[in-house]
C-alpha cells in the first residue's frame, strides 16, 4: 500500500543510522519528475535542512543544506542510476564524515557533513513519486 | 474531495475554451513546491506539449513548448500572484493569438501560440499541489 506524499516522519540520526526509501517516479523521465528527501532540524517544514537530496530524474541530482533559512553551496551530480518507470530503493547511511546514498544497492552519491546528523529531528520525502516504504534503522548501542 | 495528482483529462481546445484549476501548494513557499500544467498533443504523457506552464511557488513561472521531443525557447516571469499556503484558482483561456493565464481572477501571464490550440488532446496537472477542481469549458457554437 502507498504512503502519503509528502511523507513526514520524526527521526533521530547518528553514525550508523540508515534511512531507506522505496518508491517509483510518477512520470516518465522525459517530463523530469523530481524526488526530494530533506533531513530537517525541527518537525516544521520551514525549519533548516541538514541534508537536502533532490533528484531530477533522468537529468541530475543536487545536494545542499539550508542554514538559518539560507541555501548554501550546492553539490551537483550527473550520475543517474535511476531507471525510467522503474521502482527504486534508496538508502541514505550516516557515516562518521558524510552521508552515503545507495540506489538499488549501488553507492551513487556522498555528501560531507556540514551540520551534525544529531541535529536532525524529521525526515520528509516528497515531490513526484509514489512511496511504498520508509524506514529509519538505528545502530544498536 | 481531492482529485488524483498527476491529473490527466482528454481535452479539445479552440479559441474561447477555458481550462480552470483549483488547488493548493503542498508545501510552504520556502521549500519551493511546483505546479505544472501541460497541454499535450496526444493522450500519452511522452507526447509533445503545446503549452507548458510551470510555477515554482514564490520564485518564478516558466512557459514553453515541447516539439518533436525538444524543448523550445523558455519564457520566464517573476510575477508571483500566488499566496503562500493559500488556495489558488487558475484559469487558462484560449485567445485568438495566445493563452491568457488568470490567477485568482487577475490576468497574470500570457503565452503566444506556437502550435495551434486545436492540436491539444490532453491536459495534465501535476507536481506539488492538491487539486480540488478541474474543468474545461467550451465556447458554445
Amino acid at each position: 500500500s502507498l504512503l502519503p506524499v509528502p511523507y513526514t516522519e520524526a527521526a533521530s540520526l547518528s553514525t550508523g543510522s540508515t534511512v531507506t526509501i522505496k518508491g517509483r517516479p510518477l512520470a516518465c523521465f522525459l517530463n523530469e519528475p523530481y524526488l526530494q528527501v530533506d533531513f530537517h532540524t525541527e518537525m516544521k517544514e520551514e525549519s533548516d535542512i541538514v541534508f537536502h537530496f533532490q533528484v531530477c530524474f533522468g537529468r541530475r541530482v543536487v545536494m545542499n543544506s539550508r542554514e538559518y533559512g539560507a541555501w548554501k553551496q550546492q553539490v551537483e551530480s550527473k550520475n543517474m542510476p535511476f531507471q525510467d518507470g522503474q521502482e527504486f530503493e534508496l538508502s541514505i547511511s550516516v557515516l562518521p564524515d558524510k552521508y552515503q546514498v545507495m540506489v538499488n544497492g549501488q553507492s551513487s552519491y556522498t555528501f560531507d557533513h556540514r551540520i551534525k546528523p544529531e541535529a536532525v529531528k524529521m525526515v520528509q520525502v516528497w515531490r513526484d513519486i509514489s512511496l511504498t516504504k520508509f524506514n529509519v534503522s538505528y545502530l544498536k548501542r | 474531495s481531492l482529485l488524483p495528482v498527476p491529473y490527466t483529462e482528454a481535452a479539445s481546445l479552440s479559441t474561447g475554451s477555458t481550462v480552470t484549476i483549483k488547488g493548493r501548494p503542498l508545501a510552504c513557499f520556502l521549500n519551493e513546491p511546483y505546479l505544472q500544467v501541460d497541454f499535450h498533443t496526444e493522450m500519452k504523457e511522452e507526447s509533445d506539449i503545446v503549452f507548458h506552464f510551470q510555477v515554482c511557488f514564490g520564485r518564478r513561472v516558466v512557459m514553453n513548448s515541447r516539439e518533436y521531443g525538444a524543448w523550445k525557447q523558455q519564457v520566464e516571469s517573476k510575477n508571483m500572484p500566488f499566496q503562500d499556503g493559500q488556495e489558488f484558482e487558475l484559469s487558462i483561456s484560449v485567445l485568438p493569438d495566445k493563452y491568457q493565464v488568470m490567477v485568482n481572477g487577475q490576468s497574470s501571464y500570457t503565452f503566444d501560440h506556437r502550435i495551434k490550440p486545436e492540436a491539444v488532446k490532453m491536459v495534465q496537472v501535476w507536481r506539488d499541489i492538491s487539486l480540488t477542481k478541474f474543468n474545461v469549458s467550451y465556447l458554445k457554437r
Epitope: - | 498533443t41 523550445k72 506556437r114 492540436a119
Partner: antibody, heavy 122, light 107 residues
C-alpha cells in the same frame, strides 16, 4: 513606425565570411516576445530563411545553413548582425532582415528591410 | 527544393477569384503565413495565423488551411495584385520554411 536597414559589403570573395548588420529604428530589439530574422533571395529565385535572434538573445538557424551561420546583436546600438562563413557563389542573394512577433511560424514577419544585394565572386 | 510546394504560376481574370495553394506543411499543428512581393521590393505580409490579415491589407485577401494544404484566396483580383506570392510555415516553432513561390498573373 518600425524601420530596419541592412548594411554591409556588396561583394565578398569565395571562402570568406559574409557580414551584414541590420539597424532597427522605432523599436528596441530587446522588446519582449519579438524575434529578428535574416532571409535571403538568390536572383530570380524564392525566399530562404537563414535564422533569427530572439528578444532574449537566443538564436535559431536553418538546418541547411546552421554550420556556417552566426547571428548576434548589439543592444546598445539596436542592431543585429549576420555572419555567414565559407561563402560560395551560391550564396549570392539579396539579404533581408525582418521582424516578427514571438514565433515567426505563427505571426509571420511583419516588417522587412529593403534588402541588400551581396555578390560572391573572386 | 522547398519543404512547402506551390504552383509556379497562377492566372486569374480581372475581378475574378484567384486561389494559390501551399502543400506539404503540417498545418494541423503549425500556422501558415503568406507574403506578396513585387519586382525589386521586399516581401509584404498579407496573411498570418492561417487567416488573419495585418492592418492595411485589403479584405479581398483571405487564407485557410486544412490538413497538409493551405490556400490563399484573392476575391476580385485587381491589376495591382499581380506579383509573386510565398507561403511560410514551420517544421517546428523555431524553424521557418517558405514555399517556392507562385507568380500571379492578372489578365
Amino acid at each position: 513606425q518600425v524601420q530596419r536597414q541592412e548594411s554591409g559589403p556588396g561583394l565578398v570573395k569565395p571562402s570568406q565570411t559574409l557580414s551584414l548588420t541590420c539597424t532597427v529604428s522605432g523599436g528596441s530589439i530587446t522588446t519582449n516576445y519579438y524575434s529578428w530574422s535574416w532571409i535571403r533571395q538568390p536572383p530570380g529565385k524564392g525566399l530562404e530563411w537563414i535564422g533569427y535572434i530572439a528578444y532574449s538573445g537566443s538564436t535559431s538557424y536553418s538546418p541547411s545553413l546552421k554550420s556556417r551561420t552566426s547571428i548576434s546583436r548589439d543592444t546598445s546600438n539596436n542592431q543585429f548582425s549576420l555572419q555567414l562563413s565559407s561563402v560560395t557563389p551560391e550564396d549570392t542573394a539579396v539579404y533581408y532582415c525582418a521582424r516578427s512577433r514571438s514565433s515567426p511560424t505563427t505571426f509571420g514577419m511583419d516588417y522587412w528591410g529593403k534588402g541588400t544585394l551581396v555578390t560572391v565572386s573572386s | 527544393s522547398s519543404a512547402l510546394t506551390q504552383p509556379s504560376a497562377v492566372s486569374v481574370s480581372l475581378g475574378q477569384t484567384a486561389r494559390i495553394t501551399c502543400q506539404g506543411g503540417n498545418f494541423g499543428r503549425y500556422y501558415v503565413s503568406w507574403y506578396t512581393q513585387k519586382p525589386g521590393q521586399a516581401p509584404v505580409l498579407v496573411i498570418y495565423q492561417d487567416s488573419e490579415r495585418p492592418t492595411g491589407i485589403p479584405e479581398r485577401f483571405s487564407g485557410s488551411s486544412s490538413g497538409d494544404t493551405a490556400t490563399l484566396t484573392i476575391s476580385g483580383a485587381q491589376a495591382e495584385d499581380e506579383a509573386d506570392y510565398y507561403c511560410q510555415s514551420g517544421t517546428s516553432s523555431d524553424n521557418i520554411v517558405f514555399g517556392g513561390g507562385t507568380h500571379l498573373t492578372v489578365l
